[in-house]
């Protein structure tokens, strides 16, 4: 039975040209995390494998940095980075847990005027 829950940063915003940390946390389970996949729609950003470390997709190699922890840092943000991001925790014996983060990348002037999402 899957008892775990994923906590995420929820809806977040960041300035164009800046960077953002995508973070998820799996709790309420003793299952072993074997791998965490970070995806945007059907595009892989990165994988953190418990044995093998990080794999960064070549599409994002210039703009993605591993960590902190199992999180992911997305750099040099553009408006096209706006959208849904998913952290997919592969665990044993529970199976797969998925968390969702919505990122909005704002023009600097808009971001300066406090148009922000609330983090739930």
């Amino acid at each position: 039975m899957m008892t775990g829950t994923i906590e995420t940063t929820g809806n977040i915003s960041a300035e164009k040209g800046g960077s953002i940390i995508l973070q998820c946390h799996l709790s309420s389970t003793t299952a072993q995390v074997t791998q965490v996949n970070w995806e945007q729609q059907d595009q892989l950003l990165a994988i953190c494998n418990a044995d093998l470390g990080w794999h960064i997709s070549p599409s994002f190699k210039d703009r993605v940095a591993p960590g902190p922890g199992l999180g992911l840092t997305l750099q040099s943000l553009t408006v096209n980075d706006t959208g849904e991001y998913f952290c997919i925790y592969h665990t044993y014996p529970d199976g797969t847990y998925t968390g969702r983060i919505f990122l909005e990348v704002l023009e600097s002037s808009v971001a300066e005027h406090g148009a922000r999402f609330q983090i739930p």
Epitope: E39, Q43, S59
Partner: antibody, heavy 121, light 107 residues
């Protein structure tokens, strides 16, 4: 370039253990690669069996988990496959292969030439 | 386990033709797909990783595309030396699995 060479007996009796060695040259198995065993059955189906990481931790295909062990000898730059309780269904060509996980994920970019193993009494 | 299905076991083509081989995953695997070429009597050789990236030294007539569940491997102008079996493989999560292979035959 990394070179991999499989070796081991070509014939194994049913219920016995199959033991194969992969000798690696051109790279240290304690560096940042992962070291895999893959087999190819008659008829060409490929099956990933498992890997041992550069730190020595192993991951196995659940279909083999109760029978398989992958270990290494860092002093000889070799890694090993042991498959217990073999049956005729384990007749295959066995390959060792490596990958650079950071760059290529699980895409295996260097392979040995393979060694054929027949299970028969 | 994720099943990778290559619907065509054989494909026949002529030198100079364009040929596409398809691979379908039983569930979404993002872009974690590799393609290999295996010539008779040889071990598999990596051609494509991350669904669409050519491995070092691979001729540009070989391309890959797709994401999610549907993937395509294309040879833009088939050469006689391309006679081989082509396999897809996912590495979304372990166990990594391969397609059954598509044998390319030259007319």
């Amino acid at each position: 370039d990394v070179q991999l060479q499989e070796s081991g007996p070509g014939l194994v009796k049913p219920s016995q253990s199959l033991s194969l060695t992969c000798t690696v040259t051109g790279y240290s198995i304690t560096s940042d690669y992962a070291w895999n065993w893959i087999r190819q059955f008659p008829g060409n189906k490929l099956e990933w069996m498992g890997y041992i990481s550069n730190s020595g931790s192993a991951s196995y295909n659940p279909s083999l988990k109760s029978r398989i062990s992958i270990t290494r000898d860092t002093s000889k730059n070799q890694f090993f496959l042991q498959l217990n309780s073999v049956t005729t269904e384990d007749t295959a060509t066995y390959y060792c292969a490596t990958l650079i996980y950071y760059d290529y994920g699980g895409a295996m970019n260097f392979w040995g030439q393979g060694t054929s193993v027949t299970v028969s009494s | 386990d994720i099943v990778m299905t290559q619907s065509h076991k054989f494909m026949s083509t002529s030198v100079g033709d364009r040929v596409s081989i398809t691979c379908k995953a039983s569930q979404g695997v993002s872009t974690t797909v590799a393609w290999y070429q295996q010539k008779p009597g040889q071990s598999p050789k990596l051609l494509i990783y991350s669904a669409s990236y050519r491995y070092t030294g691979v001729p540009d007539r070989f391309t890959g595309s797709g994401s999610g569940t549907d993937f395509t491997f294309t040879i833009s102008s088939v050469q006689s030396e391309d006679l081989a079996v082509y396999y897809c493989q996912h590495y979304y999560s372990t166990p990594w699995t391969f397609g059954g292979g598509t044998k390319l035959e030259i007319k």
